[in-house]
Interface confidence: low
Amino acid sequence: IPVIEPSVPELVVKPGATVTLRCVGNGSVEWDGPPSPHWTLYSDGSSSILSTNNATFQNTGTYRCTEPGDPLGGSAAIHLYVKDPARPWNVLAQEVVVFEDQDALLPCLLTDPVLEAGVSLVRVRGRPLMRHTNYSFSPWHGFTIHRAKFIQSQDYQCSALMGGRKVMSISIRLKVQKVIPGPPALTLVPAELVRIRGEAAQIVCSASSVDVNFDVFLQHNNTKLAIPQQSDFHNNRYQKVLTLNLDQVDFQHAGNYSCVASNVQGKHSTSMFFRVVESAYLNLSSEQNLIQEVTVGEGLNLKVMVEAYPGLQGFNWTYLGPFSDHQPEPKLANATTKDTYRHTFTLSLPRLKPSEAGRYSFLARNPGGWRALTFELTLRYPPEVSVIWTFINGSGTLLCAASGYPQPNVTWLQCSGHTDRCDEAQVLQVWDDPYPEVLSQEPFHKVTVQSLLTVETLEHNQTYECRAHNSVGSGSWAFIPISAGAHTHPPDEFLFTP
């Protein structure tokens, strides 16, 4: 490590004094210090002498001696004060530039260490510092504003109390630059635009950044538009706004519009599409099948997508029958807007009752006219079964009626013993009726079918069962012949209430 003579950390001299600073090292040595006049440098191998015959306040500062060849990079320093009664400050720089949240050193060096007790930092014209300006002072280095903020970009003066009066340094301009996180933030409004030919339209492209140095432009189908720019400073951000006003749109105005902003960090862009149409339009669609089948007691949501311009002037859900004149409750109808020109309308039908099967129509109106979209809702029912004993053309016949939706299939079973339901072990015979006679089949109603089983002789210790099933469920009816006549009953479990 080099050694400095005189071997003191600080040296205090008067203006005009002769000062000699000698540095000795193992190899060649170099001096580094504040730029100031009147110094003479003399080097002799491993020593270097810095001297002046006329010290001034401008020589105040820290002088460091280094040994370039030293692998450890050791150095020695001495601080020189040239205490000039008229010049308490030696300002090394009149402009300091830092980024936000960095420490800003204002390099006003005190020329007399005795003055340290009376120093202060002020803004020019005697204005106090900003509230919560956190700073410290070092007589060797000056004032440090810790974690400087953009708003602290001001002109400062260092003040020292000399003989009862304040003596100011020349001013130091602090420039605190915003740390620019990236390209400017962008908004392009609206995100989508539709207009009828001849109408007015407005497209607004705006960009904002913490720093004022950025550019923004609006382009139409890759052509840059010449639009006056409005500038503003709001919420600690600079804003630049481009507003395109079109009094009467035509087809050539349609197309892609891009808002582009750039700064030193890069470029951002966002786009929207402008559609010009000849006349108003209203389109209804659904992602659902318009023919719906739901099991009775379950719920269903009917959804309609609407694309329209201009906006809707009216809309409603209507029940078209056939069962009753009830109308959907408004509270079950819900509307959501996907964007300006697309909407979704939902009709919620919870716990569907038999009387709610039928046609539901969504109607909407705008200046383009009325449009409607109709759903057909059929309810599914598990089969209901009944069996009677009768004579047809003189033959004893079991007649099974089954109603449900979809159309039920019918199976007859004959089993031993008297039972409410034949199980596999008891079954004597099984007949499938692939083509039962359809008695009724109206839209939105249950389908009723009839199956006949001709029985020459009823076996009294046996049970005849008619079973019907469809995709929803199954139903059955057991017929038990008894000596006094025939006895029929459904299984105990079969009590259907929708």
Partner: antibody, heavy 121, light 107 residues
Framework: QVQLQESGPGLVKPSETLSLTCTVS??????????WSWIRQPPGKGLEWIGY???????NYNPSLKSRVTISVDTSKNQFSLKLSSVTAADTAVYYC?????????????WGQGTLVTVSS | DIQMTQSPSSLSASVGDRVTITCQAS??????LNWYQQKPGKAPKLLIY???NLETGVPSRFSGSGSGTDFTFIISSLQPEDIATYYC?????????FGGGTKVESK
């Protein structure tokens, strides 16, 4: 945080000098980084800054009162004082002393409770 | 000197009301503006510093905004203890000057 307490005569005759003292506790008038201010408020009116003394001893006064005002510090008693000469009835007011942390610039972070001074013969 | 014009000079409001006070500086003062609350017989108390920053311990129903020459002070939901006179004060240039005050009374 420092506490401040004003003291001085509540009645001063016209053309005389109004003298008030502010005693500081919980801090030192000579410690770095404080502005010690005086503010006044005429009855039913707004607030008017009179001036401050910096911890280093430098002062700054309201130009409208500068010719009549002196603010000084007595470090041995941990006090600072206000002298307002040639008073008139217009100087009747509640006088507040206040402390401001130099780094904040507000000048008035902490206030005394105020003392009413009436100028009357 | 920088003149600070405060309005209104007084207002009546009910508990729960939103109260807005404005302060206008005669020249640009950046955001070197404070707001104080003063209750009868008491010294002013600092509520907002640097135009929009809430002093420690002050309820969040108080807020401030603005920059340059136009500033706003808001009490979002007036409480009985907020009945007082409110002052704005600039510290951009010496001498520091105060607005004329706004007396907030109970309706």
């Amino acid at each position: 945080q420092v506490q401040l307490q004003e003291s001085g005569p509540g009645l001063v005759k016209p053309s005389e000098t109004l003298s008030l003292t502010c005693t500081v506790s919980g801090g030192s008038v000579s410690s770095g980084g404080y502005y010690w201010s005086w503010i006044r408020q005429p009855p039913g009116k707004g607030l008017e800054w009179i001036g401050y003394i910096y911890y280093s001893g430098s002062t700054n006064y309201n130009p409208s009162l500068k010719s009549r005002v002196t603010i000084s510090v007595d470090t041995s008693k941990n006090q600072f004082s206000l002298k307002l000469s040639s008073v008139t009835a217009a100087d009747t007011a509640v006088y507040y002393c206040a402390a401001g942390i130099a780094a904040t610039g507000t000048l008035f972070d902490c206030w005394g409770q105020g003392t009413l001074v009436t100028v009357s013969s | 000197d920088i003149q600070m014009t405060q309005s209104p000079s007084s207002l009546s409001a009910s508990v729960g009301d939103r109260v807005t006070i404005t302060c206008q500086a005669s020249q640009d003062i950046s955001n070197y503006l404070n707001w104080y609350q003063q209750k009868p017989g008491k010294a002013p108390k600092l509520l907002i510093y640097d135009a929009s920053n809430l002093e420690t311990g002050v309820p969040s129903r108080f807020s401030g905004s603005g920059s340059g020459t136009d500033f706003t002070f808001i009490i979002s939901s007036l409480q009985p203890e907020d009945i007082a006179t409110y002052y704005c004060q600039q510290f951009d240039n010496l001498p520091p000057t105060f607005g004329g005050g706004t007396k907030v009374e109970s309706k």
